[in-house]
């Protein structure tokens, strides 16, 4: 019987010889559960597993805890890969996180964290980040130390308000913090002075809602 080849992330897909961008099926070791993820095989050497993408407002990101846990959307377009998969993956080896951003004026920038992982669901998928470099701000727009994940039905932030309901989307909200890449998608010329847009403060400042975002991870030793 031929052994089934499975890949835990896009780095393994890349190393197996599949070097074309696209949607691939990933499976964690010792698991039968599969997820479909978009693999970027070109940017910065390839092997990037896309865990979030915003590009046109076609997908609703105001979702429940369970939806953010298992993932939603379309891996070829706007989607969230899923907190459970990302948590398990990033606790098996060391990963870097790259966040690529686009504004409405044709500019692009990125933030690269040299170590990224999510805690377990029991710890509310708290984000852990170390070692920021890149062009999207010298200060991390994801609050440090990292916060628990919050959604419209799971209020784990540090605010007297409910950030996920006020700003929309699931995120590692503080009170509410300098970023929310899962906020409301606003079209061009309607994207400023927004209280609930797609925000990365230390690049574009307050109230500016971005055109596009991609969050991607790759093993640190790739």
């Amino acid at each position: 019987k031929e052994e089934q080849i499975s890949f835990r992330d896009c780095a393994e897909v890349f190393k197996s010889g599949h070097t074309t961008n696209g949607v691939y099926t990933l499976t964690l070791p010792n698991s039968t559960e599969e997820v479909k993820a978009y693999c970027d095989m070109e940017a910065g050497g390839g092997g990037w597993t896309i865990i979030q993408r915003r590009e046109d407002g076609s997908v609703d990101f105001q979702r429940t805890w369970k939806e953010y846990k298992v993932g939603f959307g379309n891996p070829s377009g706007e989607y969230w890969l899923g907190n459970e998969f990302v948590s398990q993956l990033t606790n098996q080896q060391r990963y870097v996180l790259k966040i690529h951003l686009k504004d409405w004026e044709g500019n692009e920038a990125y933030s690269l964290y040299e170590h990224f992982y999510l805690s377990s669901e029991e710890l509310n998928y708290r984000i852990h980040l170390k070692g920021l470099t890149g062009t999207a701000g010298k200060i991390s727009s994801i609050s440090q130390p990292g916060n628990d994940f919050s959604t419209k039905d799971a209020d784990n932030d540090k605010c007297i308000c409910k950030c996920s309901q006020m700003l929309t989307g699931g995120w590692w909200f503080d009170a509410c913090g300098p970023s929310n890449l899962n906020g409301m998608y606003y079209p061009q010329r309607q994207n400023t002075n927004k209280f609930n847009g797609i925000k990365w403060y230390y690049w574009k400042g307050s109230g500016y809602s971005l055109k596009g975002t991609t969050m991607m991870i790759r093993p640190a030793d790739f």
């Epitope: 308000c161 503080d174 002075n193 927004k194 307050s206």
Partner: nanobody, 129 residues
């Protein structure tokens, strides 16, 4: 559409007074805090004063305490900054900005700069003889 429009800036002699206005539209002051900020050439933007109309709470930076007074007229959806005993170091572009009043960290009274998501274009205040 959320808009903030500042007015009232100008040239004034040291010791003089000005009253800045911040007219808000697209939201009501009841649910928001309004802050006044200033930025002098080559310097960082800094918080000057803020008000939560609903509870009447106010905040002042140490550098303006006793000289500046913030107030609001909810019927006009406008916030004012009365500036007395002006000094040359008060010279700056003054901005007003808004933040949902509830966006507060447990145990804290006021908001970091990055929480203010709506901003006006600013009004220039020059204090010079």
């Amino acid at each position: 559409e959320v808009q903030l429009v500042e007015s009232g800036g100008g040239l004034v002699q040291p010791g003089g007074s000005l009253r800045l206005s911040c007219a808000a539209s697209g939201f009501t002051l009841d649910d928001y805090a309004i802050g006044w900020f200033r930025q002098a050439p080559g310097k960082e933007r800094e918080g000057v004063s803020a008000i939560r109309s609903s509870g009447g709470s106010t905040y002042y930076a140490d550098s303006v305490k006793g000289r500046f007074t913030i107030s609001s007229d909810n019927s006009k959806n406008t916030v004012y900054l009365q500036m007395n005993s002006l000094r040359p170091e008060d010279t700056a572009v003054y901005y007003c900005a808004a933040v949902p009043a509830g966006r507060l960290r447990f145990g804290e009274q006021w908001y970091p700069l990055y929480e203010y998501d709506a901003w006006g274009q600013g009004t220039l205040v020059t204090v010079s003889s």
